[in-house]
């Protein structure tokens, strides 16, 4: 797994931003803006919510999601799970990479209280060419999108 | 915007730390220590709270602020906003880069309860030479400084 | 302190993951998995909970811990402290590098309520060869381990 940063190569990096279309409600991963505003791809590609690796190596991957609500939606579990997951041809199921669990609704002491919370994840993982990384949030009903600055997803080779 | 990391060049990086003078109360961005203790600048400069880019490229920028209080200050909005913002001559207004909203006071179930919370932001953005990045916290009355380890601001080229 | 990233060298990086043995209850730092699953060491070494630097330079160091509980353990202080600390032969005591304080129990409005919270730290520090970085959590009784994805510790040279 030895991997070097060669001086003549552009270092892979990406930053994808939240958009109106990010929340599908289908149970799939979050979708992301890849070109407009602050979003970019450099030496990585994108497919249906996934950052796709084109060059094997160690990557610092990160995601932030902005959560918010008024009280807690009926039937919402007390736990929100925000995670980064890997898809690889080597294995049939998604693999958890970095995960956080939070109980943000618990901050609201009354059912009509507005609350906000944020979840940040970041860490170094090894990724092979062709492997994909996606972001999932359960329950995504509490993700608050606005302008791409509050919920995002990115990576760079280290 | 293609940018390479050349082997003979020092990679720009900085870590600035919170100090007693960080909170101005003037409505401006937070100010930072640049030399003492853990703080340093390498290939980036500093001016009035801003990290100033000297070499164009993609940078991972980050900030953490330590929040705390006893109950909630009278008249304090239920939302605390912590953000990283860009200033560029290309546009007349500051541009939001990475932002978090939190409702930390909501954790305190009584008005006399001590509470602590922390907000972390990090992400990759493209910055041109001469552009500035600043940190803002609204309401900064809840930022708790101590020794430079709890609130900080940094960047490095990726 | 000028340090360059040379193209023919492997860039030091590591990601260590939480394991059943991470929480010692002895008051020492958290211990980590270094080889299995997502964990790896590349150009850094490990000793009794510490990442040990073999090559001097600036490193982005990070840690996340997953916190959780049912109400608040009797006698638990209202503050949880999660920090990254440096050990150096130059100084007899550990030095705080990056620290967060949180009051996660305050989210639970009743003593029987389940709550979850997460604390993330990351920042750039200068480390000399032979220096060590450890993670501490006070009170570690609230750290929730599972599979290495929720609590972790890592670093890479920038």
């Amino acid at each position: 797994l030895i991997q070097e940063r060669r001086s003549h190569e552009v270092n892979p990096a990406a930053h994808l931003t939240g958009a109106n279309s990010s929340l599908t409600g289908s149970g799939g991963p979050l979708l992301w803006e890849t070109q407009l505003g602050l979003a970019f791809l450099r030496g990585l590609s994108y497919h249906d919510g996934a950052l796709v690796v084109t060059k094997a190596g160690y990557y610092y991957i990160y995601s932030k999601v902005q959560l918010g609500g008024v009280g807690c939606p009926l039937g919402l579990a007390s736990t929100i799970t925000h995670g980064l997951y890997k898809r690889t041809p080597r294995y049939p199921e998604e693999l958890e990479l970095l995960v956080s669990q939070q109980s943000p609704c618990g901050r609201a002491t009354s059912s009509s209280r507005v609350w906000w919370d944020s979840s940040f994840l970041g860490g170094v993982v090894h990724l092979e060419a062709g492997e994909e990384v996606v972001v999932r949030v359960l329950d995504e009903r509490l993700v608050r999108l606005r302008d791409g600055t509050r919920s995002y997803f990115g990576a760079f080779m280290v | 915007l293609i940018q390479e990391r050349r082997s003979h060049e020092v990679n720009p990086a900085a870590h600035l730390t919170g100090a007693n003078s960080s909170l101005t109360g003037s409505g401006g961005p937070l100010l930072w220590e640049t030399q003492l203790g853990l703080a340093f600048l390498r290939g980036l400069s500093y001016h009035d709270g801003a990290l100033v880019v000297t070499k164009a490229g993609y940078y991972y920028i980050y900030s953490k602020v330590q929040l705390g209080g006893v109950g909630c200050p009278l008249g304090l909005a239920s939302t605390i906003t912590h953000g990283l913002y860009k200033r560029t001559p290309r546009y007349p207004e500051e541009l939001e880069l990475l932002v978090s909203q939190q409702s930390p006071c909501g954790r305190a179930t009584s008005s006399s309860r001590v509470w602590w919370d922390s907000s972390f932001l990090g992400g990759v953005v493209h910055l041109e030479a001469g552009e500035e990045v600043v940190v803002r916290v609204l309401d900064e009355r809840l930022v708790r400084l101590r020794d430079g380890t709890r609130s900080y601001f940094g960047a490095f080229m990726v | 302190l000028i340090q360059e990233r040379r193209s023919h060298e492997v860039n030091p990086a590591a990601h260590l993951t939480g394991a059943n043995s991470s929480l010692t209850g002895s008051g020492g730092p958290l211990l980590w998995e270094t080889q299995l699953g997502l964990a790896f060491l590349r150009g850094l070494s490990y000793h009794d909970g510490a990442l040990v630097v073999t090559k001097a330079g600036y490193y982005y160091i990070y840690s996340k811990v997953q916190l959780g509980g049912v109400g608040c353990p009797l006698g638990l202080a209202s503050t949880i402290t999660h920090g990254l600390y440096k050990r150096t032969p130059r100084y007899p005591e550990e030095l705080e590098l990056l620290v967060s304080q949180q009051s996660p129990c305050g989210r639970a409005t009743s003593s029987s309520r389940v709550w979850w919270d997460s604390s993330f730290l990351g920042g750039v520090v200068h480390l000399e060869a032979g220096e060590e970085v450890v993670v501490r959590v006070l009170d570690e009784r609230l750290v929730r381990l599972r599979d290495g994805t929720r609590s972790y510790f890592g670093a890479f040279m920038v």
Partner: antibody, heavy 119, light 109 residues
């Protein structure tokens, strides 16, 4: 599109006063750092003063030759910047430009308005 | 007070040639806060370069800036007829807060 349009210039006697206006469009003036820059006939550019954005406190700074005589202000409701010039001197004769002043450079300029101080 | 001195005062060149304009500071200035402007007769100045080397929006890539410390350069790689104008350098950060050079006139030979 960002646009700045100055007005209010004209002929004034030494010791007199004049108020210049700069109407901004395409952005919110209160969110911007703004400056006035002047240029005497056939001469180079000279910075006059600046006002910071509202979020940065809206504080003002002035060049030494005009300090105490000139005042920069803003009317946020009209998205307009002002330069109040008192105790005018013949050496204040110039074209006055309204400019944005983010990150140490003047990114956007108005077309300028001529102020002539003469008896 | 930092003084910016531009040279030459006048530069006579033909279209297609390369122009090199110099700006020297009386003491070291931050390269992050060194800008260049172009001004044509009867018009307002236009920002060309900021941060010593970053091109402003819409500026053709034949314009480039370089330098650090006390010596800065604006280069126009291949002169077009519309490039003949007066060029000013400007610094920010030292008292007075913003300072301009006296200008270099680029004229057609």
């Amino acid at each position: 599109e960002v646009q700045l349009v100055e007005s209010g210039g004209g002929l004034v006697k030494p010791g007199g006063s004049l108020r210049l206006s700069c109407a901004a469009s395409g952005f919110t003036l209160s969110n911007a750092w703004m400056s006035w820059v002047r240029q005497a006939p056939g001469k180079g550019l000279e910075w006059v003063g600046r006002i910071k954005s509202k979020i940065d406190g809206g504080t003002t700074d002035y060049a030494a030759p005009v300090k105490g005589r000139f005042t920069i202000s803003r009317d946020d409701s009209k998205n307009t910047l002002f330069l109040q010039m008192n105790s005018l001197k013949t050496e204040d004769t110039a074209v006055y430009y309204c400019t944005t002043a983010m990150a140490g450079a003047f990114g956007f300029w108005g077309q300028g308005t001529l102020v002539t101080v003469s008896s | 007070e930092i003084v910016l001195t531009q040279s030459p005062g006048t530069l006579s060149l033909s279209p297609g040639e390369r122009a090199t304009l110099s700006c020297r500071a009386s003491q070291s200035v931050s390269s992050s806060y060194l800008a260049w402007y172009q001004q044509k007769p009867g018009q307002a100045p236009r920002l060309l370069i900021y941060g010593a080397s970053s091109r402003a929006t819409g500026i053709p890539d034949r314009f480039s800036g370089s330098g650090s410390g006390t010596d800065f350069t604006l280069t126009i790689s291949r002169l077009e007829p519309e490039d003949f104008a007066v060029y000013y350098c400007q610094q920010y950060g030292s008292s007075p807060m913003y300072t301009f050079g006296q200008g270099t006139k680029l004229e057609i030979k």
